[in-house]
């Protein structure tokens, strides 16, 4: 009897696992083996698939054959017993086009009211992935154990910390990984739940703000109590991408090591330009917070975003307020990069009462004023860009005195 | 593990345009920030700037007017160029990581550049 | 640019011995100072980073110390590698800029 090709054969490609799967054509058939062939683009000669000869199943394992992954290649099957079934030829493919990403490996670690999460890749060096380790980035779903509420958190590192949990709660979560660049997701890892831990007597600091004043950054952030020390510590944001860079250390800022206030302040020209993350801990000599929140600190905005310079010209009801570059030290304007809007307070001398203006324009009429009084005017800038959203410190207060009645023309 | 290796003429004449290679492997130059420094032959060390993962770059006052810092990913590597050398440019000139701030984590062997007529 | 002073320019000492070696800033750097060894025909090694804090690997018998515009390095037991040129570096402003060096030799 003549024997029948196998039919409907399957590729599955997960990381560097590269597994086949096939239909028998005749079931009635006993003791039949498989064996595969491939052939490369542009070679003629079939060669024998190795770990895919003589196979009692249907399904084999062709891991170990050394592709290019980016190459195309065509595989055939065939069925053997006494004599052989004529070739079926499994449609051409590229390994990478193919492959879909394993699910990754996870560890956590809790703290009382935050959950640090590492995340790898499932294939440690694989070879699918080889040019693609840095743009992995992860998704995950986390759900209280006792309530089964789920939460999706997008677009993480392989590195990331979720805040504002609850102390002594265990909760689950799984992670999967995509390469956005490939349009590829993979799949979940296994589910991993942890407990967090008893609420720490002291809180971490919150509320870290970055801004810029006479060529330093002041790092302000809020605390709870009194008479404590903090330290605040610094780490390149492109790290947090990157799993296996043994540069991944958070370091101090001098100036910023052991500070009895709830500010800091250290030189721009410390940090070469980039984006950081910041953090803060407090302690009482006895005990130690967990750390705050992380804060990005992106230089080249921080330093740019200086308050902006404005001239007043006076008239009996209103002021024209034209707005300049910035001054950084030497006198000379910085350029701004990104588009801004400015932000006009003005109020009278002798009021409390505030009044402000949002414009676009860097020459803004301030109207409905009474003539020989004095209003005082300061103003800062913020960054349209949504992603960005960072805003300058007020400028200083000047205050002009209106003109008499008549000068409004 | 991070390793920087530079490369160069050896010897130039004064007016002339100097080109070093540095060369990393074990890291990508597309983190961190990668810069040069030189040491003159009485020992004396002078930061010349960097380029940063993002190609964003610095350079020291001193030398504005006659340097150049830039880097091609795909070859892993990124460069110097000097303009108008004079004997007061010969020296042993080293690249180097840095990480944020300006110290020096990871340097080359360094390379030596002799200027003379 | 800030001017690093470091002193002695060259010192010699036995095996066993603690040495200090000193920097003095003309402007105070917060502490914002490193640490570099370098041996005949090699690259320098950065041993010290914030004035004090050890880099991953460097042996516990070094230390760094200091505030203000004044800095040191202290070598306790010295090493028979411990032997060669120790700079200091500023990285409180820009350009960061390096002592003139000390030279240790064996006594």
């Known amino acids: 009897k003549n024997l029948k090709s196998p039919q409907k054969v399957e590729v599955d490609i997960i990381d560097d696992n590269f597994i086949l799967r096939w239909n028998r054509s005749d079931e009635s058939v006993g003791n039949v083996t498989f064996s595969f062939d491939y052939q490369k683009t542009g070679m003629d000669n079939w060669i024998k698939l190795s770990g895919c000869q003589n196979i009692t199943s249907t399904k084999c394992n062709f891991s170990s054959l050394k592709l290019n992954v980016y190459e195309e290649i065509k595989l055939r099957i065939r069925a053997e017993k006494e004599n052989t079934s004529s070739w079926y030829e499994v449609d051409s493919f590229t390994p990478f086009r193919k492959a879909q990403i394993g699910p990754p490996e996870v560890h956590l670690e809790a703290e009382d009211k935050a959950i640090v999460i590492h995340i790898s890749p499932g294939t440690k060096d694989s070879v699918m992935w080889a040019l693609d380790g840095l743009s992995f980035t992860y998704s995950l779903v986390i759900w209280k154990n006792s309530s089964g509420v789920e939460e999706r958190i997008e677009n993480i590192y392989s590195r990331h910390k979720i805040y504002k949990l609850s102390p002594e709660t265990t909760y689950c979560l799984k992670v999967k990984a995509a390469l956005l660049t490939s349009w590829k997701i993979g799949v979940y890892s296994p589910v991993h739940c942890i407990k967090t831990t008893v609420e720490n007597e002291l809180p971490p600091p919150e509320n870290i703000e970055v801004s810029v004043q006479n060529q330093n950054y002041v790092l302000k952030w809020d605390y709870t109590y009194a008479n404590m020390t903090f330290q605040v510590q610094w780490l390149h944001a492109f790290l947090k991408r990157n799993p296996g860079n043994h540069l991944y250390k958070w370091k101090q800022i001098p100036d910023c090591e052991n500070v009895k206030t709830t500010q800091c302040v250290f030189p721009q020209n410390v940090f070469q330009k980039g984006i950081y993350l910041l953090r803060v801990q407090a302690s009482d000599g006895n005990n130690t917070s967990f750390w705050s929140e992380e804060i990005k600190f992106d230089t080249e905005i921080q330093a740019f975003l200086l308050p902006p310079v404005f001239n007043i010209r006076s008239l009996s009801d209103s002021f024209h307020i034209y707005i300049g570059a910035p001054k950084q030290s030497g006198n000379t304007p910085v350029i701004q990069d990104y588009p801004l809007i400015y932000e006009i307070i003005f109020w009278e001398n002798t009021s409390n009462a505030e009044r402000k203006i949002i414009e676009k324009k860097t020459d803004v009429t301030v109207p409905n004023l009474k003539p020989l009084t004095v209003y005082c005017v300061k103003a800062r800038a913020h960054t349209m860009d949504e992603k960005l959203n960072k805003s300058s410190v007020f400028s200083d207060a000047v205050c002009e005195k209106t003109k008499p009645g008549n000068t409004s023309k | 593990e991070v390793q920087l290796q530079e490369s160069g003429p050896g010897l130039a004449k004064p007016s002339q345009t100097l080109s070093l290679t540095c060369s990393v492997t074990?890291?990508?130059?597309?983190?961190?920030?990668w810069n040069w420094i030189r040491k003159f032959p009485g020992n004396k060390l002078e930061y010349m700037g960097y380029?940063?993962?993002?190609?964003?770059?610095y350079y020291n006052p001193s030398l504005k007017s006659r340097i150049s810092i830039t880097r091609a990913t795909s070859k892993n590597q990124y460069y110097l160029q000097l303009n108008s050398v004079t004997n007061e440019d010969t020296a042993t000139y080293y690249c180097?990581?840095?990480?944020?701030?300006?110290?020096?984590?990871?340097w080359g062997q360094g390379t030596t550049l002799t200027v003379s007529s | 640019d800030i001017q690093m002073t470091q002193s002695p320019a060259s010192l010699s000492a036995s095996v066993g011995e603690t040495v200090t070696i000193t920097c003095r800033a003309s402007?105070?750097?917060?502490?914002?100072l490193a640490w570099y060894q370098q041996k005949q025909g090699k690259s320098p090694q950065l041993l010290v980073y914030?004035?004090?804090t050890l880099e991953d690997g460097v042996p516990s018998r070094f230390s760094g110390s200091g505030s203000g515009t004044q800095y040191s390095l202290k070598i306790n037991s010295l090493q028979p590698e411990d032997f060669g040129s120790y700079y200091c570096?500023?990285?409180?402003?820009?350009?960061?800029?390096f002592g003139s060096g000390t030279k240790l030799e064996i006594k």
């Open positions: 914030n004035a004090k």
């Open positions: 570096q500023h990285f409180w402003s820009i350009p960061p800029t």
């Open positions: 074990g890291y990508s130059i597309t983190s961190d920030y």
């Open positions: 380029i940063s993962y993002s190609g964003s770059i």
């Open positions: 402007g105070n750097i917060h502490n914002y």
């Open positions: 180097a990581r840095s990480g944020g701030m300006y110290y020096f984590d990871y």
